[in-house]
Interface confidence: medium
């Protein structure tokens, strides 16, 4: 596959991909890698993947852990391989921060979005065909 014209050189990293969003792939390419843990209906849901758009990752990665969601991000090929996100220990609070409730969000597969992974709401997911 060859790029048609001069364009931005996005400096992509190879990331480990694990979870529903990955389809049959075990890796993805993005400007940041992540490892996340969320509580869904009482279950621990671990995911790994990549943010293809830097701004999207920046926002999510700066979000401090909440009791229901933790995301750890890194930059470097396969840098999320040995990272396991951890929820904050009980009693630890993060004053003055606005937590995104990412446990209500999921990642659609890169394939479905034509090569771009995006965070979308649970509501949107109901109207989206999954493999």
């Amino acid at each position: 596959m060859e790029d048609e014209k001069p364009k931005v050189n996005p400096k992509l990293y190879m990331c480990v991909c694990e979870g529903l969003s990955c389809g049959n792939e075990d890796h993805c390419e993005g400007q940041q890698c992540f490892s996340s843990l969320s509580i869904n209906d009482g279950f621990h849901v671990y995911q790994k993947g990549c943010f293809q758009v830097y701004e999207q990752g920046k926002m999510t990665c700066k979000t401090p852990p909440s009791p229901g969601q933790a995301v750890e991000c890194c930059q470097g090929d396969w840098c999320n391989r040995n990272i396991t996100a951890q929820l904050p220990t009980k009693g630890k609070s993060f004053p003055g921060t606005q937590n995104f409730h990412l446990e209500e969000q999921k990642l659609i597969s890169e394939e479905d979005l034509g090569g771009e992974q995006k965070l979308i709401s649970e509501e949107d997911l109901h109207h989206h065909h999954h493999h």
Epitope: M1, K11, L12, Y54
Partner: antibody
Framework: EVQLVESGGNLVQPGGSLRLSCAAS????????MSWVRQAPGKGLEWVSG????????YYSVSAKGRFTISRDNSKNTLFLQMNSLRAEDTAIYYC???????????????WGQGTLVTVSS | DIVMTQTPLSSPVTLGQPASISCRSS???????????LSWLHQRPGQPPRLLIY???NRFSGVPDRFSGSGAGTDFTLKISRVEAEDVGFYYC?????????FGGGTKVEIK
């Protein structure tokens, strides 16, 4: 120690073809993008083409597009540059360069091979 | 394509004295990730180039601290605090923010 050794440079007539090779050692070849950079005699540096570690994405300069094809054989740790429709202005030393990461181009060109000389002349 | 313009073309310097090379890009080099991908390379006569500085000011592994890079936007500078005999040769700036990657025309550093 990371090593890159280019070969395949030769004297070729205008309109002719040549295939350059770069044998890599000392690192996990498939984990890194690679590029070809050339330098005409007594002139500056010109980036020619790049390829991701898995070989899926390729990029070319305006002068190389349509005439040159970059490829790699990760099982043999070898990078290639197939050059067709060669012109006098393609005469240069061609360097093979290791990139910073799998899909990372420029910014961190290290190391460079010693280069192979391509001369296009009748 | 982004055009990289280096000045001066040639810089005769005295051993132990400072030297400065300028590089100007035809457009800003800030990438979508916020970083500026401007590198400096050094090429001694008869040798392949070697990387000195990446992302404007980061010295590459093994590069002496007499080399420093600075700048922002479209204007960048490489400084050698005290020139040594081994520093002769050509210096090139290079942008890798946009394809195709492009180099400056080079600056020749020679001893007076």
């Amino acid at each position: 120690e990371v090593q890159l050794v280019e070969s395949g440079g030769n004297l070729v007539q205008p309109g002719g073809s040549l295939r350059l090779s770069c044998a890599a050692s000392g690192f996990t070849f498939s984990n890194y993008a690679m590029s070809w950079v050339r330098q005409a005699p007594g002139k500056g540096l010109e980036w020619v083409s790049g390829i991701t570690g898995n070989g899926i994405k390729t990029y070319y300069s305006v002068s190389a597009k349509g005439r040159f094809t970059i490829s790699r054989d990760n099982s043999k740790n070898t990078l290639f540059l197939q050059m067709n429709s060669l012109r006098a202005e393609d005469t240069a030393i061609y360097y093979c360069v290791k990139e910073r990461g799998h899909s990372w181009f420029g910014d961190w060109f290290d190391p460079w091979g010693q280069g192979t000389l391509v001369t296009v002349s009748s | 394509d982004i055009v990289m313009t280096q000045t001066p073309l040639s810089s005769p310097v005295t051993l132990g004295q400072p030297a400065s090379i300028s590089c100007r890009s035809s457009q800003g080099l800030v990438n979508s990730d916020g970083n500026t991908y401007l590198s400096w390379l050094h090429q001694r006569p008869g040798q392949p180039p070697r990387l000195l500085i990446y992302e404007i000011s980061n010295r590459f592994s093994g590069v002496p601290d007499r080399f420093s890079g600075s700048g922002a936007g479209t204007d960048f500078t490489l400084k050698i605090s005290r020139v040594e005999a081994e520093d002769v040769g050509f210096y090139y700036c290079m942008q890798s923010t946009q394809f195709p990657l492009t180099f400056g025309g080079g600056t020749k550093v020679e001893i007076k």
